[in-house]
Interface confidence: low
């Protein structure tokens, strides 16, 4: 008769590398009688008998882990019990080793010159790979600019046009490499202009040609513009050269001019542009041909978009270096002020200030602008805006809200023309029109004042300031 | 979380060279700019120059000649050397993280006081 | 080297009150990218410098809300609403658009 043994583990569980895929074996023999029960944990949890992902065999001591996977690592414990004495435990740890994985590789990316670009690269593997980058067919080097994150992306500060090339991402360990695919970091440049036209003194009848060069990535287009509008006559030669477009518009000179040569290209969705202006002066111009003080230009605006009838020629005010840009600005301003104003007010004044800041225009030697009618910003100042008008007009007075950035250029009512004297001379507020049939208190359409003589512009207009405190209601 | 610790004597000679060490705890050095940055007593902070974990330096121009930065990434370390002192670099001298997501010095060590005399 | 200017170099404030600090480059710290590249620091007394804004108006973590960074270009201001004794200590501002990195000259912020 065998006396009863205590388990005893004769062979202790040691430390297991697996491949992923790859079968992994833990041997725990054990001496005891009679014959132990023998059970297995991972990570103090109990593996089931019927699981299919093991296999336990040779009476328990031998378990197989059929087909490793990166979540099988832990510590793997046998435990043996007979009823004779305590139970015994050995314990072993594996270590599921993976040949590197790229999980997120890098992309095509398109970045603008001077903008942060990441090329992503994660990757997997055991031992954690080291990720290196190669562009074109030499290794990349890190410097102030361009690192390799800790996740194994690639970052690159301030992007330059020589950055642009093939890159491709390599991850590295004892076990293997594995490479991306080769992606392409195409770098655009904002358009920009080399060589701005040149302003010209001529006779009149002569021929002049204005040149621009502009480059950019991708390469930009140039278009020119005559007195804000498309350039209607003479001929445009170009040619492109290593990213650089050389623009000749050659005209024959019968008035004078301001021609901007505008450069654009397309990052995505967006466009950068980058315009020059030249003015083409005749000697000897008569003085009544100079007195005009703009032109005439559609719309391209945000701002009055839809309070402006559809392509409808602007008159633009040249004595602003930039009129297209600064009238946007001065219509912005007004309409971050209009956003306290009482419902009714609101879309009168801004049909008003639109009108008023971009006047229609009639084009010709000298383009004129056609103010609004009398009729129209009396109907503004009176009725829909009354209350606000008269706050306003109070404020000024006692010189509150001089402040430039919340000035309101409304016009000067009584200065403007009447639209009975002369209908062709000004302008109507459509918007007034639609609404006065649903108001019966409509001011009476002649001049609460003496008829005068009508300018032809405002001579002026009177600002009045409304500021971020004082609400317009 | 990360923690940086400046070591180095606290008393150099004249026309010897001062050499500070920084070591990162809690976290990598990897994928920072490290800095160092200096304070003369009662004065206001100068910027000494910064090394990559790849290696790579920027000096301030003013120091450049006499400025050396080095990396360890297997000790977690960084140091500075400043050769030929005068009394005018005794300052307390700090090294710092740059966070270039940040664009900003969010991780500073305490400071070593420096003292130049013979 | 960009030179950044601050004034005013000490402020007495009464706590709850609130205080103003005032930086100036001299030149744009503003990237075509819409960022500013302008950071704020305060050393309290002892204490290395901690990051309070960073590219001119985002809070660093753990900072109070109290803390405020505004300004574009050239000009930025750090404003904090009310005061507290724990504030005290000197304010930096610094360019990190180019290197080298430049601080301002500091100013004290003392209780009264």
């Known amino acids: 008769e065998k006396l009863p043994k205590a388990p005893v583990i004769t062979t202790p569980l040691e430390t297991v590398d697996a491949l992923v895929e790859e079968v992994a074996t833990f041997m725990c023999a054990v001496e005891s009688y009679p014959q132990p029960e023998i059970s297995w944990t991972r990570n103090k949890i109990l593996i089931k008998l019927f699981d299919t992902r093991y296999s336990i065999r040779e009476n328990g001591q031998l378990l197989t882990i059929l087909s490793v996977e990166d979540s099988d690592d832990g510590i793997y414990c046998c435990i043996a019990n007979n009823g004779v004495g305590g139970a015994v435990e050995s314990c072993g740890a594996l270590q599921v080793k993976m040949k590197p994985k790229i999980t997120r590789p890098p992309i095509n990316v398109k970045i603008i010159e001077g903008l942060k670009a990441v090329l992503p690269c994660t990757t997997m593997g055991n031992p954690k790979p080291s990720v290196s980058w190669i562009k074109g067919d030499n290794a990349l080097r890190e410097n102030s600019r361009i690192a390799v994150l800790e996740s194994g992306s690639l970052r690159i500060h301030n992007v330059q046009k020589e950055d642009a090339g093939q890159y491709r991402c390599v991850a590295k360990n004892s076990l293997g490499t594995a490479y991306s695919k080769l992606v392409k970091l195409e770098v655009e440049v904002f358009a920009r202009i080399l060589r701005a036209p040149e302003s010209h003194n001529v006779t009149f009848g002569s021929f002049v040609t204005l040149r621009c060069t502009a480059i950019g990535i991708p390469v930009p287009t140039i278009s020119w513009i005559e007195n804000g509008n498309a350039v209607s006559s003479g001929s445009i030669q170009e040619s492109v050269k290593d990213r650089v477009i050389d623009s000749r518009l050659q005209l024959f000179i019968t008035k004078p001019g301001l021609y901007t040569c505008i450069a654009t290209n397309k990052h995505g969705e967006k466009f950068s542009t980058a315009k020059a202006a030249a003015t083409v002066s005749i000697a000897e111009w008569s003085k009544s041909q100079k007195d005009s003080q703009g032109y005439c230009a559609q719309y391209r605006g945000e701002v009055c978009d839809a309070v402006l009838a559809k392509d409808a020629l602007v008159f633009f005010n040249t004595s602003y270096r930039d009129p297209e840009d600064a009238q946007e600005l001065l219509i912005h301003t007004a309409w971050n002020e209009l956003k306290a104003v009482s419902p009714l007010c609101r879309p009168a004044a801004e049909a008003l200030l639109c009108n008023h800041l971009f006047q229609e225009c009639s084009p010709g030697v000298v383009p004129t602008p056609m103010p609004i009618c009398r009729e129209y910003c009396l109907a503004v100042k009176e009725l829909f805006c009354a209350k606000e008008w008269q706050a306003m007009e109070g404020k000024a007075h006692r010189g509150l809200y001089r402040s430039g950035m919340h000035l309101l250029p409304v016009p000067e009512c009584s200065k403007l023309p009447s639209m009975h004297r002369d209908p062709t001379a000004c302008t109507r507020l459509p918007y007034l029109d639609y609404k006065k049939e649903n108001i019966t208190t409509f001011p009476s359409i002649t001049s609460s004042r003496p008829s005068a003589d009508i300018p032809n512009l405002p001579a002026s207009t009177s600002s009045f300031a409304v500021s971020p405190a004082y609400s317009m209601t | 979380q990360v923690q940086l610790q400046e070591s180095g004597p606290g008393l150099v000679k004249p026309s010897e060279t001062l050499s500070l060490t920084c070591t990162v705890s809690g976290g990598s050095i990897s994928s920072y700019y490290w800095t160092w940055i200096r304070q003369p007593a009662g004065k206001g902070l100068e910027w000494i120059g910064r090394i990559y974990t790849s290696g790579s330096t920027d000096y301030n121009p003013s120091l450049k000649s006499r400025v050396t930065m080095s990396v360890d990434t297997s000790k977690n370390q960084f140091s500075l050397k400043l050769s030929s002192v005068t009394a005018a670099d005794t300052a307390v001298y700090y090294c710092a993280r740059y966070n270039w997501n940040d664009d900003a010095f969010d991780i500073w060590g305490q400071g070593t006081m420096v003292t130049v005399s013979s | 080297d960009i030179v950044m200017t601050q004034s005013p170099l000490s402020l007495p404030v009464t706590p709850g009150e609130p205080a103003s600090i005032s930086c100036r480059s001299s030149?744009?710290?503003?990237?075509?990218?819409?960022?500013?590249?302008l950071d704020w620091y305060l050393q309290k007394p002892g204490q290395s410098p901690q990051l309070l804004i960073y590219l001119g108006s985002n809070r660093a973590s753990g900072v109070p809300d109290r803390f405020s960074g505004s300004g574009s270009g050239t000009d930025f201001t750090l404003k904090i609403s009310r005061v507290e004794a724990e504030d005290v200590g000197i304010y930096y501002c610094?360019?990190?658009?180019?290197?080298?990195?430049?601080f301002g000259q500091g100013t004290k912020l003392e209780i009264k």
């Open positions: 610094m360019q990190a658009l180019q290197i080298p990195h430049t």
């Open positions: 030149q744009s710290l503003l990237h075509r990218n819409g960022y500013n590249y």
